[in-house]
């Protein structure tokens, strides 16, 4: 009779059952970026706190050298918020001078690197023109979506201008992923 | 033979298996905020609709007195959007007058309260300067991320100015959490 | 003895266990929108790429004719980002002329259609006034939340102005949903 109880549940299952608690997960938080060498023609990658405060990695999801390392294939929800802050851009002055205006902008990209593939893949991009009237501005860009990733894939967050990232608080700028 | 079928699946599992359908979940939607006493030096907390329209709480996730109550320990995805609306801030006029400019701003914070811990923990913050040229402005701030929570933790959403929150529609301003 | 190992786990379960890998999931990406007839008084719906590049549908989650079709009842996390781009709105000029100013705006709505229900339900809305100083502007609106959906429900993404949607890259404008 006990066997009969299990059978229907077992027939419904097409992949091995697994406890949710042992799925790869990470939430990384901002740390101050020191001036470094960037790759030419590529937005610089942020590095992250992975164990202090709100930050954690678990169940074989590891963080190393600006990358989150995907330990098993599957569908992951990936998210990041970057808060930017800066001084007034010159766009209003440029416009007043009557010249065409390519606005200043802030951009966040979540990028996937697959060792067997020569080019990184941009998974998510948030980009915003910045043309503020006030002398100081600040604003977040949030991104999040689901992607099919392979074991060994690496994820990073790139930004258009690393020196505008607000690094002061772990709740303002962060990056995470979890297996669904 | 049936035992052999189950054994491998069982060996893979380090935490008790549980049906997804019985996990704690909530999606709360905006209601009009009544004026209340706010704590000094703390952003006011929003209160929410928890059962009408799109709003719900289920599987022991309860809403009470501005707080979502976490019924069991685990990793939760927590999210909120707050739509703000207001009149032009004075920042453009201030700038024209040549005075230094501290911009108006809008801020959303998702806060965790743990009874055994004296200070609330800010989990997520979205903050944006508002310095609009037009006479009326409106815009959302969205936040979402994963956190390890303990049974008994309480979650709330705080905002910098409760009078600027758009409470007109349940799809514009909301707050939710679910156990992963 | 093996039976005893399984029993506690089984007693905890109130709904049938199911493997995460076979849950309905979709991530759709932007394609160029061809001019079509829009319903009067309704924001136009975007159509999407569902199989090329980063886009996919799986486990009976189907995309057809601008809609994601929900194949089974349950709680879904639904998300979308739409990146808009355009030229300066006239709001600053209008304001200078001393007339009251209803600003230009951009809006994204995630809508649920239930065949048995006459009116679509707006699940999520992100709306933002656009009143930029610079001559070109671009910015994303991101939305995401959890909803209880029924088998047969259909989801779509509506926007206030389809001609302002940035359709150039699959990482800038997207739409997804997955069963929790």
């Amino acid at each position: 009779l006990k066997g009969q109880e299990f059978a229907p549940s077992h027939q419904q299952v097409y992949a091995p059952l697994r406890a949710d608690g042992d799925k790869p997960r990470a939430h990384l938080t901002v740390v101050r970026q020191t001036p470094t060498q960037h790759f030419k023609n590529q937005f610089p990658a942020l590095h992250w706190e992975h164990e202090l405060g709100l930050a954690f990695t678990k169940n074989r999801m590891n963080y190393t050298n600006k990358f989150l390392l995907i330990p098993e294939s599957g569908d992951y929800f990936i998210y990041s918020q970057v808060t930017f802050r800066g001084m007034t851009s010159e766009c209003s002055e440029i416009r007043q001078a009557g010249r065409p205006n390519k606005p200043d902008s802030i951009t966040v990209v979540i990028t996937k690197v697959t060792d067997s593939y020569p080019e990184p893949t941009q998974l998510l991009m948030g980009t915003k023109s910045v043309c503020e009237v006030g002398s100081n501005w600040f604003q977040p860009i949030y991104l999040g979506a689901m992607f099919s990733l392979q074991e060994g894939d690496k994820l990073m967050v790139n930004v258009s201008d690393i020196s505008l990232v607000d690094y002061t608080k772990e709740d303002k700028t962060f990056f995470g992923a979890f297996l669904l | 033979l049936k035992g052999q079928e189950f054994a491998p699946s069982h060996q893979q599992v380090y935490a008790p298996l549980r049906a997804d359908g019985d996990k704690p979940r909530a999606h709360l939607t905006v209601v009009r905020q009544t004026p209340t006493q706010h704590f000094k030096n703390q952003f006011p907390a929003l209160h929410w609709e928890h059962e009408l329209g799109l709003a719900f709480t289920k599987n022991r996730m309860n809403y009470t007195n501005k707080f979502l109550l976490i019924p069991e320990s685990g990793d939760y995805f927590i999210y909120s959007q707050v739509t703000f609306r207001g009149m032009t801030s004075e920042c453009s006029e201030i700038r024209q007058a040549g005075r230094p400019n501290k911009p108006d701003s809008i801020t959303v914070v998702i806060t965790k309260v743990t009874d055994s811990y004296p200070e609330p923990t800010q989990l997520l913050m979205g903050t944006k300067s508002v310095c609009e040229v037009g006479s009326n402005w409106f815009q959302p701030i969205y936040l979402g991320a994963m956190f390890s929570l303990q049974e008994g933790d309480k979650l709330m959403v705080n905002v910098s100015d409760i009078s600027l929150v758009d409470y007109t529609k349940e799809d514009k301003t909301f707050f939710g959490a679910f156990l992963l | 003895l093996k039976g005893q190992e399984f029993a506690p786990s089984h007693q905890q379960v109130y709904a049938p266990l199911r493997a995460d890998g076979d849950k309905p999931r979709a991530h759709l990406t932007v394609v160029r929108q061809t001019p079509t007839q829009h319903f009067k008084n309704q924001f136009p719906a975007l159509h999407w790429e569902h199989e090329l590049g980063l886009a996919f549908t799986k486990n009976r989650m189907n995309y057809t004719n601008k809609f994601l079709l929900i194949p089974e009842s349950g709680d879904y996390f639904i998300y979308s980002q739409v990146t808009f781009r355009g030229m300066t709105s006239e709001c600053s000029e209008i304001r200078q002329a001393g007339r009251p100013n209803k600003p230009d705006s951009i809006t994204v709505v995630i809508t649920k259609v239930t065949d048995s229900y006459p009116e679509p339900t707006q699940l999520l809305m992100g709306t933002k006034s656009v009143c930029e100083v610079g001559s070109n502007w671009f910015q994303p609106i991101y939305l995401g939340a959890m909803f209880s959906l029924q088998e047969g429900d259909k989801l779509m993404v509506n926007v206030s102005d389809i001609s302002l949607v940035d359709y150039t890259k699959e990482d800038k404008t997207f739409f997804g949903a997955f069963l929790l």
Epitope: R32, Q33, T34, P35, T36, Q37, H38, P44, R85, G86, M87, E90, S135, N136, D161, I162, S163, L164, V165, D166, Y167, T168, K169 | P100, K102 | -
Partner: antibody, heavy 118, light 107 residues
Framework: EVQLVESGAEVKNPGASVKVSCKAS????????LHWVRQAPGQGLEWMGW????????NYAQKFQGRVTMTRDTSISTAYMELSRLRSDDTAVYYC???????????WGQGTMVTVSS | DIVMTQSPSSLSASVGDRVTITCRAS??????LNWYQQQPGKAPKFLIY???RLQSGVPSRFSGSGSGTDFTLTINSLQPEDFATYFC?????????FGPGTKVEIK
């Protein structure tokens, strides 16, 4: 290793101009704001302004507006600060500094002593 | 401009002492406060950012706290190399401004 190397000490007459250089190495010069800060003998630190090497955009403290010019030559990763109409109270050590964010100064040059004296 | 003040302007202490320096801003600067150490004849060295976060490579005996207008730099168990002048600096808005400095001398 991130380094900023400034030009040598200068002695100038009142009313003259001085141009101090700052050569950067060990990081992407165009990726970070470069600041100039001065320190009069026995005094505190005074921020003069920054230059964004990528675009050449600048932001000067009001006090130095009209007298200071910050420029850069990206081909040799070098920034310049020129101060005109020198007065005796401009006598100071002039530092260039770079920050991982635009609002702080991680790495400093060794400083250039500028003496204004007739 | 935001005016930064520091107290005390100087203090005398011994190796092993706990030293506290305060910095006050003329208006709220959130957490955008940095601390620097300057040895005589040298360029300043970056110690603390975001009011309380230690710059990489800075010994853990240094700590910072505060937000808004009132901030503190604490040195637990003063070491011989810590005798120097300490400056706070606000990064909230331009022009960036420094405190006048606190000189920590050997008692």
């Amino acid at each position: 290793e991130v380094q900023l190397v400034e030009s040598g000490a200068e002695v100038k007459n009142p009313g003259a101009s001085v141009k101090v250089s700052c050569k950067a190495s060990g990081y992407t010069f165009t990726g970070y704001y470069l600041h100039w800060v001065r320190q009069a003998p026995g005094q505190g630190l005074e921020w003069m302004g920054w230059i964004k090497p990528k675009s050449g955009g600048t932001n000067y403290a009001q006090k130095f507006q009209g007298r200071v010019t910050m420029t850069r030559d990206t081909s040799i990763s070098t920034a310049y600060m020129e101060l005109s109409r020198l007065r005796s109270d401009d006598t100071a050590v002039y530092y260039c500094a770079v920050g991982g964010s635009y609002d702080a100064f991680d790495i400093w040059g060794q400083g250039t002593m500028v003496t204004v004296s007739s | 401009d935001i005016v930064m003040t520091q107290s005390p302007s100087s203090l005398s202490a011994s190796v092993g002492d706990r030293v506290t320096i305060t910095c006050r801003a003329s208006q709220s600067i959130s957490s955008y406060l940095n601390w620097y150490q300057q040895q005589p004849g040298k360029a300043p060295k970056f110690l603390i950012y975001g009011a309380s976060r230690l710059q990489s490579g800075v010994p853990s005996r240094f700590s910072g706290s505060g937000s808004g207008t009132d901030f503190t730099l604490t040195i637990n168990s003063l070491q011989p190399e810590d005798f120097a002048t300490y400056f706070c600096q606000q990064g909230y808005s331009s022009p960036f401004t420094f405190g006048p400095g606190t000189k920590v001398e050997i008692k």
